[in-house]
């Protein structure tokens, strides 16, 4: 048993033009985290297995906000090591897959969105108990610098963590008359103390007092970087003009990289940059499989049908990208009709409808004649696929919900004064006139111009009070009718309001989930 440890030193834009300035998208700040996957790299079969040696996820790094016009720095990283415990023997040869993920922190309904920024896959040989191995890898336009090691956990020791040991100070468990100690038991040794001042970062020791340098470093304490020549990596006959070598036939000729990998020359050799899902010296090994769970956000992983892809992710609604890592703004498609408000809840889309509309996409107009939508006694008139309301006296607007001023048109004749009432209007006639609109003159002898009409009512006439009482009764009857109409309308609307309130409750629950 033991632990594989990975220390990320830096992650940032690689050298050269076209390097990204920021890992964040235009949507705002983000932070990074890393995923490491270990596979025993001994055979094709093992390479196809999931992260059989284990996997680990780092904590989130500090929030990064791009500074305008500032040079792109190495990005703030999560603290601490990534540790992958292994229960069995350390295989020695293994495949290391490191993924750098971005978590976007912009205002997004349904939580943060993740996207895969970079993935490096390397096949490595490493003995347990050895020093930190350092590596620099390019992944697209990004550069990742990291160190790793495998260490055994007591009582396991050895390059594969298969031998057991006991502390030297511990008494022997083999007493008199007992059989010999287990042959696998060794005495545990304390790690050697390196030469004083030996760089902790660039040096290590296997014997006390020594200081051996990691690749790229030199000097007695491993503090001096090895100088590099601009002519390194060029082959062929010498050039007398520059002192450099003139290039001969390159190792990338004929492209040794399989599965669509791209070849780049390195000093004396070549390196393949492999497409997603493949790794190895020549991209010959399929690295990430469906068993590794490469599809984020619950995406369905399906084995790739074409040779260039090890898997394909079928994403849930609201997500896209090769690993379902990108959240889709489905509301940008404006699915809610009739001015409804769109809410993308991640796995579900909800429309909050304006008053008078209903349905999953607010497609149902409640204000049609089937819903008897004309208020205050108005009559619905359909025609041409639309409807309009013929409103009762004193009301107007699309659904007769707006009060109209019945006196605006000056309906009272002969100088009569108009008063707006619940039921419409009442005319107070000038002396000498009578009728609902003061349209009839009253003759001096008390008989109206219309023979069938009752005698005119003069001011102070004892019959006037009776007529007013009749008018009041009529007004009350009309008001009562309107109240009945309004109550029945409210009952109908309450049904829709209840449904809307229920839907909003569900929305709040989903948003808070």
């Amino acid at each position: 048993a033991g632990v594989f440890e990975l220390q990320i030193h830096s992650f940032g834009p690689g050298p050269g033009p076209g390097a990204p300035r920021s890992p964040c998208s235009a949507r705002g700040p983000c932070r990074l985290f890393f995923r490491v996957c270990l596979k025993p790299g001994l055979s094709e079969e093992a390479a196809e297995s999931p992260c059989a040696l284990g996997a680990a996820l780092s904590a989130r790094g500090p929030v990064y906000t791009e500074q305008p016009e500032a040079p792109a720095p190495d990005l703030p990283l999560p603290n601490g090591l990534l540790q992958v415990p292994f229960r069995d023997a350390w295989p020695g040869t293994f495949s290391l897959i490191i993924e750098t993920w971005r978590e976007e922190l912009g205002d997004q309904i349904g939580g943060p969105a993740w996207s895969l920024l970079a993935r490096v896959t390397r096949r490595r040989r490493l003995a347990a108990g050895g020093p930190w191995a350092r590596d620099i890898q390019r992944a697209g336009a990004w550069e990742l610098r990291f160190s790793y090691r495998a260490r055994c956990e007591l009582p396991a020791v050895g390059t594969a963590c298969t031998r057991l040991c006991r502390p030297r100070s511990a008494p022997s468990r083999c007493g008199p008359g007992l059989r010999p100690c287990a042959p696998l038991e060794d005495e545990c040794e304390a790690p050697p103390v390196c030469r004083a001042g030996c760089s902790l970062e660039h040096g290590f020791c296997e014997q006390p007092g020594e200081c051996r340098c990691l690749e790229g470093w030199t000097g007695p304490l491993c503090m001096v970087p090895v100088s590099t020549s601009s002519c390194l990596g060029l082959r062929g006959p010498s050039s007398t003009t520059t002192g450099c070598l003139v290039p001969g036939p390159g190792p990338c000729d004929g492209n040794p990289c399989a599965n669509g990998g791209s070849c780049s020359e390195t000093p004396g050799s070549f390196e393949c940059t492999c497409p997603r899902g493949f790794y190895g010296l020549r991209c010959e090994v399929s690295g990430v499989t469906c068993a590794d769970g490469p599809c984020f956000n619950g995406g369905l992983c399906v084995g790739g049908a074409d040779p260039d892809s090890a898997y394909i992710c079928h994403c849930p609604p609201g997500f896209q990208g090769s690993n379902c890592e990108k959240r889709v703004d489905r509301c940008s498609l404006q699915p809610c009709r009739n001015g409804g408000l769109c809410l993308d809840l991640g796995h579900a889309l909800r429309c909050r409808c304006r008053a008078g509309f209903a349905g999953p996409r607010c497609e149902h107009d409640l204000d049609d004649c089937a819903g008897r939508a004309c208020a205050n006694g108005g009559t619905c008139v359909e025609g041409g696929g639309a409807h309009r309301c013929s409103c009762a006296l004193g009301f107007g607007g699309r659904n007769c919900r707006e009060r109209a001023d019945p006196c605006a048109a000056r309906p009272c004749a002969h100088g009569g004064r108009c008063y707006a009432h619940f039921s419409g209007l009442v005319c107070a006639c000038a002396p000498g006139y009578m009728g609902a609109r003061c349209e009839f003159p009253v003759h001096p002898d008390g008989v109206s111009a219309l023979p069938a009409a009752p005698p005119g009512l003069r001011p102070g006439d004892p019959q006037r009070a009776g007529v007013i009482a009749v008018i009041v009764v009529v007004v009350i009857a009309i008001v009562a009718g309107i109240v009945v109409l309004v109550i029945s309308r409210k009952k109908r609307m309450a049904k829709y309001e209840k449904a809307e309130i229920k839907e909003m409750g569900e929305m709040h629950r989903e948003l808070n989930a």
């Epitope: 993740w114 769970g293 490469p294 995406g299 369905l300 849930p316 609604p317």
Partner: antibody, heavy 117, light 107 residues
């Protein structure tokens, strides 16, 4: 080969509790959403609940019928997901399956829970 | 929740015949429909995802079609091992829901 193995089912009285386990092998368990789906005798399938990843703070979601009574948890180090069922009702009698992802791609063989007095 | 209605409830056919199973959704679910097969005493298994895509290892005689609210699972020529219960499930809206199932039995 991917395997999901459920355990912990049995007979329990109404109001009682039960804890189901689902052990996974052959997958990088920590990268998979895990669900519980149940099937009452002679009936169809019903989604019960879901737990997401460590990177999603192990977010959980439940069906309305079990909300407040059932709790899903996971132990990535043991490749295991759990369903803690409290205040059991007779209508919770079913075969309980654990499944992976949003689309229920891998399924276990199921464990039977009987709630009866 | 979105309701899925499967028909017929039972389909009696002979080996070699063509089976057509229907699934109707109560509202538009795009193409986010999957089909599952369940044999007696076994767990369901995913056959079709995204309305028309065969899952890994599923024989070509199984095909799915449809979008919106109407979906169809077709088994072009029934094999003896295809007699089972088939469920459709929608994954457009969370939570996922299933149809009541169609039993394909030997005539």
């Amino acid at each position: 080969e991917v395997q999901l193995v459920e355990s912990g089912g049995g007979l329990v009285k109404p109001g009682g509790s039960l804890r189901l386990s689902c052990a996974a092998s052959g997958i990088t368990f920590s990268n998979f959403w895990m669900n519980w789906v149940r099937q009452a005798p002679g009936k169809g399938l019903e989604w019960v609940g879901q737990i997401r990843l460590k990177s999603e703070d192990y977010a959980t979601h439940y069906a309305e019928s079990v909300k407040g009574r059932f709790t899903i948890s996971r132990e990535d180090s043991k490749n295991t997901v759990y369903l803690q069922m409290n205040s059991l009702k007779t209508e919770d009698t079913a075969v309980y399956y654990c499944t992976t992802g949003y689309y229920f791609d891998y399924w276990g063989q199921g464990t039977t829970v009987t709630v009866s007095s | 929740n979105i309701v899925l209605t499967q028909s017929p409830a039972t389909l009696s056919l002979s080996p070699g015949e063509r089976a057509t199973l229907s699934c109707k959704a109560s509202e538009n679910v795009g193409t986010y429909v999957s089909w599952f097969q369940q044999k007696p005493g076994q767990s369901p298994r995913l056959l079709i995802y995204g309305a028309s895509n065969r899952y890994t290892g599923i024989p070509a005689r199984f095909s799915g079609s449809g979008s919106g609210t109407d979906f169809t699972l077709t088994i072009s020529s029934l094999e003896p091992e295809d007699f089972a219960v088939y469920y459709c499930g929608q994954f457009y809206s969370f939570p996922s829901t299933f149809g009541g199932g169609t039993k394909v039995e030997i005539k």
